[in-house]
Interface confidence: low
Amino acid sequence: EEELQVIQPEKSVSVTAGESATLNCTVTSLIPVGPIQWFRGAGPGRELIYNLKEGHFPRVTTVLDPTKRNNMDFSIHISNITPADAGTYYCVKFRKGSPDVELKSGAGTELSVRAKPSAPVVSGPTARATPEHTVSFTCESHGFSPRDITLKWFKNGNELSDFQTNVDPAGKSVSYSIRSTARVVLTRRDVHSQVICEVAHVTLQGDPLRGTANLSEAIRVPPTLEVFQRPMRAENQVNVTCQVRKFYPQRLLLTWLENGNVSQTETASTLTENKDGTYNWRSWLLVNTCAHRDGVVLTCQVEHDGQPAVSKSHALEVSAHQKEQCSDTTSGPVLAPTAPLGGSG
């Protein structure tokens, strides 16, 4: 009589997670009588996948009716494959007995599961940095298989080269994770900039996944200050303006000091936005030139986004003509009561 053979024709089968896999197995003889069972793995720790006689295997069905007489095809169909299903599957023939005795095993079919990477998540620095400084962005994606994967970084469409990427674990696994850290040098124009992490994998059919982060979350553009005075229609008044330019983010506290003493504090409200995403703001004081003391210095002090204050001072300039307009009896504060102490516009 011909010796029974258990034939598993494919050495390996590769499927995408969520799909079904067919594992083929045929036997060459109907004798000796006894069941076929499917296992994942070999040796004492192997896992029973399918046993026709007993057990509940909701995701496994036989391709043909195994109860049919003269059936020699014991191929199985596993539905809704996940990366955890990866491994080598063995079709094993048993001789009927009490208990059944293992007679012969197929050579095994390795099931590899192609799993899509998760949407890349890009995280930026926890604290803001100023232009010319380097910040790091991290991109993570998980759950993919096989291990081969390509990750690229872009800033505003331009590919970056300063990054380091690791794929874990290094050895064999049902699925893998990738983590990459890119270093980006900030510029003053980066408020509207975006970094993109792009992940390409065999499961994505040429349509890579992208994760993004806005540099607006990572950048602080400190303001530049300018203080100047302009005459007003009333000959004994001048307008002293503090122009705060090109700052980001919006959080800003402005304090006016007169000869070093705080005269007024205000929070930036009506800001104008520049094309590059930074903001401008101006605050002004109406100053009564008749109430001046010699050598009045007005200082505009700005605290931006919780950083140490920066300031710009201006020595009040009063012309001889303005002095002539003042009567000898004029007295009062330098800051004119004819208007709110500060304004914004």
Epitope: K116, S118, V121, E217
Partner: antibody, heavy 122, light 112 residues
């Protein structure tokens, strides 16, 4: 109470350009995405694209080559232009506001215009 | 693009009875920040769509509490605990995880 009102011609000739405007009243344009969505007769909804208040645009790839969305904050309006229209572009066009929060992303299209019917026919 | 599939296509309902609509996405809408980027909208006959549920389960302002959203990953459900006559119309799910934003084909709810 924010309200949106679409305006533009109801009839456009094939191969010409469709131009629609959405006027935002009762609220600010800042910090929202402003979206265009269309619905062909008897069919479902299709997202055309949106614009953030800072001018950044996002388009549906299937329409990207023909669509431009722009915004004018000074008059609280945003606009849709679609070139080379065909009968397949016949639809009710809606403008809508999409909430967005830092760290969360898109947070629901919470205000819609009443829609304007555009027919493409010669 | 993420494909959104709604079922059933049509749902005849009895006022006062519960109703349920399913929405499945071709990829997970659950992001690493814990939010599920799935919205539900109702378009009543002759009207514009109205936001009912955002982020899978959050009821929009002014929406009655008989509407609830649940689900995570790729499978989402909109439940109406007791259908009222004013609930007739087409319900749409929409993913907001990535552009292009995509809608389900709609489920038409009508009174039996």
């Amino acid at each position: 109470q924010v309200q949106l009102q679409e305006s533009g011609p109801g009839l456009v000739r094939p191969s010409e350009t469709l131009s629609l405007t959405c006027t935002v009243s009762g609220g600010s344009i800042r910090n929202y995405y402003w979206s265009w969505i269309r619905q062909p007769p008897g069919k479902g909804l299709e997202w055309i694209g949106f614009i953030y208040y800072n001018g950044r645009t996002f388009y549906n790839p299937s329409l990207k080559s023909r669509v431009t969305i722009s915004l004018d904050m000074s008059i609280n309006q945003f606009s849709l232009k679609m070139t080379s229209v065909t009968a397949a572009d016949t639809a009710v066009y809606y403008c809508a506001r999409v909430r967005a929060y830092s760290g969360i992303g898109l947070d629901g299209t919470d205000v819609w215009g009443q829609g304007t019917t555009v027919t493409v026919s010669s | 693009d993420i494909v959104m599939t709604q079922s059933p296509l049509s749902l005849p309902v009895t006022p006062g009875e519960p109703a349920s609509i399913s929405c499945k996405s071709s990829q997970s809408l659950l992001y690493s920040n814990g939010y599920a980027y799935l919205d539900w909208y109702l378009q009543r006959p002759g009207q514009s769509p109205q936001l009912l549920i955002y982020q899978g389960s959050n009821r929009a302002s002014g929406v009655p509490d008989r509407f609830s959203g649940s689900g995570s990953g790729t499978d989402f459900t909109l439940k109406i605990s007791r259908v009222e006559a004013e609930d007739v119309g087409v319900f749409y799910c929409m993913q907001a995880l990535q552009t292009p934003l995509t809608f389900g084909g709609g489920t038409k709810v009508e009174i039996k």
